[in-house]
Interface confidence: low
């Protein structure tokens, strides 16, 4: 008996073989099948040659099918949609010869580390390409050259450290570009060309505000209505533009579009003068002082294991007056979670005054697996004198563009209605073993460092602030089962946490990278500020104020 459901909807024969425990293609598929669902089956490997008789096949869904290998060795002349997301593919074969009609390719949440230059050759009808949540560090410069009709490109939550110049050349139809949650520090001059790009997502990258960022800063100013903060399950066109979501990681966390680079040399190449001459703009930078933003720590016995594809973690960027903690909007911390998520980014060491080292060089050779430090970690004991900000240190004023207590995910989902698979990430990326930070002298006394010379930084306080990252606040007791949720303002993807204004006495749970577990975006409760304002979890007595 044929175990799959056959239906005819919108004039097409649709066969649903999802979650049937299939290890191979079932016999008896209708020859005029147009839509074939094979998701959530332990297929392991798949060859399109098996589908040769299905000459009318228009959609093939292989999501979460434990695929380690995809062979595109059989011609499927009418296939328009191929979904191989949430699998274990380490590479993609060349697709164009066998799938000439492909319009949508979803290879999100695989283990792709690189793409060959010819992967998309022949896919002249491709409209949507989803590569979110892989491990891509670089991209072939001409990867998209064959896909002139591309409309949506999702490269979010990879490990991209750079973008090739001319990468978007010829993509006149492109309307949505997801680049959030990568390791990008700048974009090449002219990268966006004259594309309109109505929907662009650039937040959650360690944008380095120096002279090289001026092109992006100007582009953001010119396209401020086209830059969005991505929200789980919300279509791009339904969200509100938020150009402030793109922030400098090294310069007081200000929005990139406000960065003027007054000390930068004028552009020498005359061709770009009119676009990149920033000296003709006299507007003053907005003040960089902001009210303290409350970080809410709540407790729950909910210890269900989540898989995460959320953003990266940058516990510190080593500026004495402004530790930059890049935390996704909501973190769950639990002893049970000892692995970094696969998208975990580089951790800039506190001993480096300038985070100029490319993140890719910061990968460990071993993986931390236990939350217990083997040596006494640097701690901020609640019994010690609270570290208070120096009066000469102006608090930052990053006005939240939306209600700050609403957590916002930082990655888009190509499949917002379906839960993510519970696969365990396998390649954590901390720079050093995060559970055993070494104190400079004694564990209880954070040691200052010298102030790096950075023109943009204000005069440092007379008493230098400790450079110990907030990720090493150690407990006096180890948590056993409760989950701690730290909810941070959406308005600041990169959070500057120079010091605690009062010690956290209510919770002594650690924020230790080996314990950090980032829940799937769709699993986060989407409470509005109104509905959560009076919620017990937002009680100010629960935690500390963190000046941002």
């Amino acid at each position: 008996e044929f175990i799959c459901e056959v239906s005819k909807v919108t004039s097409q024969v649709e066969v649903n073989c999802d979650n049937k425990g299939l290890k191979a293609l079932p016999p008896g598929l209708p020859g005029d099948t147009a839509i074939l669902h094979l998701a959530e089956n332990p297929l392991g490997a798949f060859s399109t040659a098996l589908l040769g008789p299905l000459t009318r096949l228009a959609q093939l869904h292989l999501r979460q099918s434990q695929l380690t290998q995809l062979q595109v060795d059989g011609m499927l002349p009418r296939l328009e949609t191929l979904d191989v997301s949430h699998n274990r593919l380490k590479s993609l074969p060349s697709l164009g010869r066998a799938l000439p009609a492909l319009t949508t390719l979803d290879a999100s949440f695989n283990e792709l580390v690189a793409l060959s230059p010819g992967t998309l050759d022949g896919l002249s009808h491709l409209h949507e390409l989803y590569l979110r949540g892989n491990k891509l560090k670089t991209l072939p410069p001409r990867l998209l050259a064959p896909t002139a009709q591309l409309r949506k490109l999702n490269l979010a939550d990879n490990r991209l450290t750079e973008l090739p110049p001319g990468f978007l050349e010829g993509l006149g139809e492109l309307d949505t570009l997801y680049l959030q949650g990568n390791w990008l520090r700048t974009v090449p001059k002219g990268f966006f060309g004259d594309l309109l790009l109505p929907f662009t997502f650039l937040h959650g990258n360690p944008w380095s505000c120096d002279c090289e960022i001026l092109y992006l800063a100007r582009w953001l100013r010119d396209n401020s209505n086209n830059v969005y903060l991505w929200k789980e399950g919300v279509e791009a066109k339904a969200t509100t533009p938020n150009v402030d979501s793109v922030r400098c990681v090294n310069w007081k966390n200000v929005p990139v579009h406000t960065y003027q680079g007054k000390d930068c040399p004028s552009p020498m190449d005359g061709g770009d003068m009119d676009y990149d001459n920033y000296d003709d703009e006299d507007e003053k930078l907005p003040g960089v002082e902001a009210p303290a933003t409350r970080a809410v720590v709540s407790f729950s016995t909910h210890t269900k294991a989540h898989t995460t594809h959320w953003g990266l973690l940058y516990p510190t960027f080593a500026y004495p007056d402004h530790q930059m903690a890049y935390l996704s909007s909501t973190l769950e911390l639990t002893e049970k979670q000892t692995m970094f998520p696969s998208t975990l980014g580089p951790i800039m060491p506190t001993t480096t005054p300038e985070p100029t080292t490319p993140p890719t060089t910061l990968e460990p050779t071993t993986t931390p697996t236990t939350p217990e430090p083997t040596t006494p970690p640097t701690t901020l004991e609640p019994t010690t004198t609270p570290i208070t900000p120096e009066p000469t240190m102006p608090p930052t004023t990053l006005e939240p563009t939306t209600t700050p207590i609403t957590p916002e995910p930082t990655t888009p989902s190509t499949t917002p209605t379906t839960p993510q698979p519970a696969t365990t990430p396998t390649t954590p990326q901390p720079a050093t073993t995060p559970t055993t930070p070494q104190p400079a002298t004694t564990p209880t006394t954070p040691q200052p460092t010298t102030t790096p010379t950075i023109p943009e930084l204000p005069t440092p306080p007379t008493t230098p602030e400790p450079t110990m990252p907030p990720t090493t606040l150690e407990p006096t007791t180890t948590p056993t089962s409760p989950t701690t949720t730290l909810i941070l303002s959406e308005s600041n993807t990169f959070l500057g946490i120079p010091e605690l204004t009062s010690p956290c006495t209510t919770s002594e749970y650690p924020i230790v990278p080996s314990l950090v577990h980032l829940p799937e975006a769709h699993e986060v409760a989407r409470g509005t500020s109104d509905s959560s304002r009076n919620h017990r979890l937002f009680n100010p007595d629960l935690c500390c104020l963190l000046p941002l």
Partner: antibody
Framework: QVQLVESGGGLVKPGGSLRLSCAAS????????MSWIRQAPGKGLEWVSS???????YYPDSVLGRFTISRDNAKNSLYLQMNSLRAEDTAVYYC????????????WGQGTLVTVSS | DIQMTQSPSSLSASVGDRVTITCKSS????????????LAWYQQKPGKAPKLLIY???TRESGVPSRFSGSGSGTDFTLTISSLQPEDFATYYC?????????FGQGTKVEIK
């Protein structure tokens, strides 16, 4: 050229049965979905049944459980087995070829009349 | 089921006239995935089988004269004969091929004035 020729119509009493046939030629029969559409005297068109190239049948509620569509690709033939016939089944029955899986009908036979009357 | 309603049920026209027949569906026939409207038009002459004229709202079947055109989207559709010819006097049916069961309009009879 594409040709569809229906046969098997006639007069039958209510509750009786009839089997219609459609002989197809001029195209690769096995590659196409096929359908039966009927037209009561002086009335409009009503879809009766379809069968995909792989043999999956489809029916409207009005004939479900009474009519059975089948095909024999080796004989290039389409069939409609009609049981428990009612007076309202009286109509000219057309055999038609469905275009792809889009279910509009690009070629029709000349029709065969089925009369259900006591 | 999707109901199809044609209007008028009959009309009289002369050779050379521009004739418009409308068809309304009880729900949208637009497939948002490919932006196509799943509506077809047929012509039937007395004693003959129907003949396909147009599918996907506006795509003419091969061999169909260009004076026949279709338009519309969602739930409202139109068949237009730009210049009526003697051989065009017949009954015209719309059919939705969006969702099973496939349903037809009741027909519009175009007669000689």
């Amino acid at each position: 050229q594409v040709q569809l020729v229906e046969s098997g119509g006639g007069l039958v009493k209510p509750g009786g049965s009839l089997r219609l046939s459609c002989a197809a030629s001029g195209f690769t029969f096995s590659s196409f979905a096929m359908s039966w559409i009927r037209q009561a005297p002086g009335k409009g068109l009503e879809w009766v049944s379809s069968i995909t190239s792989a043999g999956t049948p489809y029916y409207p509620d009005s004939v479900l459980g009474r009519f059975t569509i089948s095909r024999d690709n080796a004989k290039n033939s389409l069939y409609l087995q009609m049981n428990s016939l009612r007076a309202e089944d009286t109509a000219v029955y057309y055999c038609a070829r469905s275009r792809g899986y889009e279910d509009y009908f690009d070629y029709w036979g000349q029709g065969t009349l089925v009369t259900v009357s006591s | 089921d999707i109901q199809m309603t044609q209007s008028p049920s009959s009309l009289s026209a002369s050779v050379g006239d521009r004739v418009t027949i409308t068809c309304k569906s009880s729900q949208s026939l637009l497939n948002s995935r490919n932006q196509k409207n799943y509506l077809a038009w047929y012509q039937q002459k007395p004693g003959k089988a129907p003949k396909l004229l147009i599918y996907f709202t506006s795509t003419r079947e091969s061999g169909v004269p260009s004076r026949f055109s279709g338009s519309g989207s969602g739930t409202d559709f139109t068949l237009t004969i730009s210049s009526l010819q003697p051989e065009d006097f017949a009954t015209y049916y719309c059919q939705q091929h969006y969702s099973s069961p496939w349903t037809f309009g009741q027909g519009t009879k175009v007669e000689i004035k």
